[in-house]
Amino acid sequence: MMTGTIETTGNISAEKGGSIILQCHLSSTTAQVTQVNWEQQDQLLAICNADLGWHISPSFKDRVAPGPGLGLTLQSLTVNDTGEYFCIYHTYPDGTYTGRIFLEVLESSVAEHGARFQIP
């Protein structure tokens, strides 16, 4: 029975050349988190494993930093970084929870964070 919910930073925007923190939080469950995967439109960016810590995909090593916590920091943003990002929580005994974040990378200096929202 999956009772948990994932709260994410929702729809967010950031400036080109800057950095942004992607955050998800799993709540309302006592399930044990085995691993958290971060993906960008079907590409694996990074893994945070409960036993082994962080693994950053080689093709993203220069621009992705682990943390804070189970979150992920994207650096040196380009317009091509605009799109959907997913946090995938592998838990036991519940199973797999998925959260979605949409990032828009702006040319301008006006980049406001969107409201937080929940995905059951």
Epitope: Q32, T34, Q35, A50, H55, P93, T96
Partner: antibody
């Protein structure tokens, strides 16, 4: 080349014990989640147990919980399944399997070892 | 537990045919569906994971699709080495359950 080689299967009486081993090579064993999956003769596949890379976390199917224990020795690149209080319905080919780093699927499997529980 | 139901249970086809195997989950499993191929006396081999992602080295004639509860594995042009049993498996929640298998035989 990834290789997984199971051993330790055989004929055992109901109530008996057996320890299966799976020798791994060709990859960084300690970095990967591993599982045991079984297949009764002429039947489908059944997930049995999973262990995290460091061995801290272990998960079991209800049908084997309290009877089977999964473990690993990362210094020996070996996965184990200790099977106690064996029943006739545990008769199956037991496969060890390596998960993708992403934990999305089991990408390599051993050839299997047959466990027969019979009096 | 999530029940996985494959159809058909067996299928006769010829080399060059296009075939589709269906897997239905008893509840929503998002895209957490894997397809394996197994030949008699051999271990299963990974074909497709995350519903549609091909594993390294899998021929392009194999493709997967679907999300939620309904999934399909398609072989676009059957080759002699494709005759085997195919299993789907859900990775949404424990226990990770398999379908009963679809046996693909030569007509």
């Amino acid at each position: 080349e990834v290789q997984l080689v199971e051993s330790g299967g055989g004929l055992v009486q109901p109530g008996g014990s057996l320890r299966l081993s799976c020798a791994a090579s060709g990859f960084t064993f300690s970095s990967y989640i591993m599982s045991w999956v079984r297949q009764a003769p002429g039947k489908g596949l059944e997930w049995v147990s999973t262990i995290s890379g460091g061995g801290t976390n272990t998960y079991y199917a209800d049908s084997v919980k309290g009877r089977f224990t999964i473990s690993r020795d990362n210094s020996k690149n070996t996965l184990y399944l200790q099977m106690n209080s064996l029943r006739a319905e545990d008769t199956a080919v037991y496969y060890c399997a390596k998960w993708l780093l992403s934990y999305y699927a089991m990408d390599y499997w051993g050839q299997g070892t047959l466990v027969t529980v019979s009096s | 537990d999530i029940q996985m139901t494959q159809s058909p249970s067996s299928l006769s086809a010829s080399v060059g045919d296009r075939i589709t195997i269906t897997c239905r989950a008893s509840q929503n499993i998002n895209v957490w569906l894997t397809w394996y191929q197994q030949k008699p006396g051999k271990a299963p081999k990974l074909l497709i994971y995350k519903a549609s992602k091909s594993h390294t080295g899998v021929p392009s004639r194999f493709s997967g699709s679907g999300s939620g509860t309904d999934f399909t594995l398609t072989i676009s042009s059957l080759q002699p080495e494709d005759f085997a049993t195919y299993y789907c498996q859900q990775g949404q929640s424990y226990p990770y359950t398999f379908g009963q298998g679809t046996k693909l035989e030569i007509k």
